[in-house]
């Protein structure tokens, strides 16, 4: 498998994108900040558009609205116009808190075009984010979408790398987050091999 | 109604190349990740190339067996795909389809398929 | 990369029968909770039609004969009573690991 990285940066500098750092698409920036490419100086991450603001694409709007006819609109307005077929920003760094995806650089909502209005999704079923999959499951990475998986249970993988990501692919696959009353902590092992596999254990009461 | 339209197949002689479209209507094609997967005649299904939608940074996806040699592209503002194919092979004959993944992560809407034919 | 293989190559059944389909892979095919096969049905002359994704969800306009099971590396896909229409290839594929892989198909024949 080869990736075409052109649009994309290293973890490292996508971690760091803040107001004001450069980008080069709406994915190099964090939670609430869209890439606004002005005509004259070079690209930088700018804060997400509130509603009824203008905008060119869904990204640039913050998240609960999006870009309906070059204006930010709650999504409950624009849902029947757009059949739910959405795509926004929804970049939240989301270590430690259940029900999101595993990774440093969530990537923005895929849409679901034929889920009834209310429905949460199911497992496997495109997703926007994790709020439109049902209990239980996150809005995660799969190849080149997103789709709802399973929130990880006690004593699942939770490592970044749990999955047999490579040089070229690194990250294609997220996973959940551990569940409520989970944290995801190094498996304590006379075996060095695994020695960094990081598995949800219970937290413990103090 | 989600609609792909392949075009540009045809017969073209070893080592050369061609480019084929894909033309998507019906859903928000600038959102959506999009694929080709070919089928060889008698044979069966084979993937070829995918690209992310915007909300993934419209990356591009290979196997080892056209990497180098074919590109994949889209340019949303005419709802388009395409598939670059250079240095093409007798083994590159087949048909190919574009494929969408919209309410789930598989190939759940296809086109009927364009015909590629590499003969000298 | 995972290998599936499909069997029987060739299946000869009368409409009304069931049809039982096998799907094996050469290594797991479950992460995430999730069973991360597909069926596919194609016609002669005609693209795939996605059936059933993640191991045993109906994809849209599906009919209810055709059902999806298995987990790990053996699926299954069971038409309960054969339609005319339902003689075809059907493919499964993988993907949870890159690259995503067909199976070399089981073609349902009229006996």
């Known amino acids: 498998l080869v990736l075409d990285f052109n649009n994309i940066r290293s973890s490292a500098d996508l971690h760091g994108a803040r107001k004001g750092s450069q980008c080069l698409s709406d994915t190099d920036c964090n939670t609430r900040k869209f890439c606004l490419q002005p005509r004259d100086e070079k690209p930088f991450c700018a804060t997400c558009r509130g509603l009824r603001r203008r905008c060119q694409r869904d990204a640039m709007c913050c998240p609960g609205t999006l870009c309906v006819n070059d204006v930010c609109t709650t999504m409950e307005d624009a849902t029947p116009i757009l059949e739910r077929q959405l795509d926004e920003q929804d970049g939240t760094h989301a270590e430690g808190t259940t029900g999101h995806p595993v990774q440093e650089n969530q990537p923005k909502r895929k849409p679901s075009i034929k889920k009834s209005q209310g429905r949460k999704g199911q497992e496997g079923e495109s997703c926007l984010r994790t709020f439109d999959c049902g209990p239980g499951l996150c809005c995660a990475r799969h190849f080149w979408t997103k789709i709802c998986k399973p929130v990880l249970l006690e004593g699942q993988v939770c490592s970044r790398r749990g999955h047999k990501d490579t040089a070229q692919a690194p990250e294609i696959f997220q996973r959940c987050d551990c569940g409520p009353g989970l944290l995801c902590r190094s498996q304590l092992t006379s075996n060095r091999q695994h020695a960094r596999l990081r598995v949800c254990q219970k937290i413990e009461k103090l | 109604e989600v609609q792909l339209v392949e075009s540009g197949g045809g017969l073209v002689q070893p080592g050369g190349s061609l480019r084929l479209s894909c033309a998507a209507s019906g859903f928000t094609f600038s959102s959506y990740a999009i694929s080709w997967v070919r089928q060889a005649p008698g044979k069966g299904l084979e993937w070829v190339a995918s690209?992310?939608?915007?909300?993934?940074?419209?990356?591009?996806y290979y196997p080892d067996s056209v990497k180098g040699r074919f590109t994949i592209s889209r340019d949303n503002a005419k709802n388009s795909l395409y598939l670059q194919m250079n240095s093409l092979r007798a083994e590159d004959t087949a048909v190919y389809y574009c494929?969408?993944?919209?309410?789930?992560?598989?190939?759940?809407?296809w086109g009927q398929g364009t015909t590629v034919t590499v003969s000298s | 990369e995972i290998v599936l293989t499909q069997s029987p190559a060739t299946l000869s059944l009368s409409p009304g029968e069931r049809a039982t389909l096998s799907c094996r892979a050469s290594?797991?095919?479950?992460?995430?909770?999730?069973?991360?096969i597909n069926w596919y049905q194609q016609k002669p002359g005609q693209a795939p039609r996605l059936l059933i994704y993640?191991?045993?969800k109906q994809g849209s306009g599906i009919p209810a004969r055709f059902s999806g099971s298995g987990s790990g590396t053996d699926f299954t896909l069971t038409i309960s009573s054969l339609e005319p229409e339902d003689f075809a290839v059907y493919y499964c594929q993988q993907l949870k690991e890159v690259p995503p892989t067909f199976g070399g198909g089981t073609k349902v024949e009229i006996k």
């Open positions: 494929a969408t993944s919209l309410e789930n992560y598989a190939f759940d809407y």
């Open positions: 690209v992310s939608g915007t909300g993934l940074g419209f990356q591009t």
């Open positions: 993640a191991g045993s």
């Open positions: 290594e797991s095919v479950d992460d995430f909770g999730i069973s991360f």
